[in-house]
């Protein structure tokens, strides 16, 4: 080994990474807020939907103040990519009545990537323990029909609101923590 | 500009002990995950044990599990590796490295040898 | 024996393209854990050359490029240059090993 020698900086540290996956979130928030409202317009939904293989929700206002890093990251990406998937599954087995969306659902399946990117990157930097998501039980093949599959939209938009509703709040509370 | 500092290699006898340090500069490294990294002469590099950002995950490449001791004092910005029951296959220079990791030492060689 | 496995060595002439490759399994690459490059010339450190999957530190000129596909990813130099003659190692999160891995390395010869 040589002499010590200095390392520029790299591109962002943890702190810079936790701010990035705040702004990506609320944009994120942003863009499943509208989708949802898009959705409510072309086919007004009758009632909450719901779909077995979406995770549980993680958080509730009352459990905010008790949070710690690793448990929130963790939670959040393998909500997170469970959510990419069923995204992912929607596009595929969207009927055509769901095709007119497709460019937004593409735009939001991207955007999911890089948050879930941003998020594991922080991770890494922080050394924190990153549990391999688990395949999520998605619905095998294609909705039973084009109802079906709407009512899916429904319930993953839905459920992916309320998600990233809860994780502005969890990463803004983490902030002051790192 | 960003600084880690290995120090504490040397040459020790099979079944010895030895106490790797690493002192960090120009950056947050209370904020940072810290690695020990080791290359054998001429092979390849080897994840040997993390520490996450605040000390409170540690884990370790099973090669060194129950030998090696990783801690960190971000008060002192400062990484170590205390090393049990040395073997020769332990000889390598060992990198101290932060983050991904982003930023690596220039290593410090440790020999175990009689 | 490394768990992610690349080629031992690579060549090219300066001004060609090269590609390293860098093979895992369902506990690292393909569990969407992200692959990260490193360089290290010759009697030095490593260095940091691509962070998750394709992004590039500030330094790193352009002509280094990574990609990832299921359980593999590669890492592309463009416009080969003689100061890129360097051992190259990919790196990934292992969620069996519960910290990163690395591949055994590759050796690139600069050629002419």
């Known amino acids: 080994p040589g002499p010590p020698a200095g390392s520029p900086r790299v591109s962002s540290d943890p702190r810079a990474d936790l701010d990035s996956a705040v702004l990506l979130t609320r944009s994120l928030l942003a863009d499943t807020r509208q989708l949802a409202a898009q959705m409510r317009d072309k086919f007004p939904a009758d009632g909450d939907h719901n779909l077995d293989s979406l995770p549980t929700l993680a958080m509730s206002a009352g459990t905010l103040g008790s949070l710690q890093l690793p448990g929130v990251l963790t939670r959040l990406r393998v909500d997170l990519m469970s959510y990419f998937r069923h995204v992912q599954w929607l596009r595929r087995a969207a009927g055509p009545s769901l095709k007119t969306l497709e460019p937004e659902l593409g735009a939001l399946q991207a955007r999911l990537e890089r948050l879930l990117r941003r998020l594991q990157l922080l991770m890494s930097r922080l050394a924190l323990p990153q549990a391999a998501p688990d395949q999520p039980a998605v619905p095998l093949g294609p909705p039973a029909s084009a109802w079906g599959s709407i009512r899916a939209a429904h319930a993953i938009l839905g459920g992916l609101h309320l998600t990233l509703d809860w994780a502005v709040r969890g990463l803004l509370l983490l902030k002051t923590r790192l | 500009e960003v600084q880690l500092l290995e120090s504490g290699g040397g040459l020790v006898q099979p079944g010895g002990s030895l106490r790797l340090s690493c002192a960090a500069s120009?950056?947050?490294?209370?904020?940072?995950?810290m690695h020990w990294v080791r290359q054998a002469p001429g092979k390849g590099l080897e994840w040997v044990a993390v520490i996450s950002y605040d000390g409170s995950y540690k884990y370790y490449a099973d090669s060194v599990k129950g030998r090696f001791t990783i801690s960190r004092d971000n008060s002192k910005n400062t990484l170590y590796l205390q090393m049990n029951s040395l073997r020769a296959e332990d000889t390598a220079v060992y990198y101290c490295?932060?983050?991904?990791?982003?930023?690596w030492g220039q290593g410090t060689l440790v020999t175990v040898s009689s | 024996q490394s768990v992610l496995t690349q080629p031992p060595s690579a060549s090219g002439t300066p001004g060609q393209r090269v590609t390293i490759s860098c093979s895992g399994s369902s506990s690292n690459i393909g569990s969407d854990y992200d692959v990260h490059w490193y360089q290290q010339l010759p009697g030095t450190a490593p260095k940091l050359l691509i962070y998750?999957?394709?992004e590039r530190p500030s330094g790193v000129p352009d002509r280094f490029s990574g990609s990832k596909s299921g359980t593999s990813a590669s890492l592309a130099i463009s416009g080969l240059r003689s100061e890129d003659e360097a051992d190259y190692y990919c790196s990934a999160w292992d969620s069996s090993l519960s910290g990163p891995v690395f591949g055994g390395g590759t050796k690139l010869t600069v050629l002419g």
């Open positions: 120009g950056f947050t490294f209370s904020s940072y995950g």
């Open positions: 490295a932060a983050g991904v990791p982003d930023y």
């Open positions: 998750s999957n394709e």
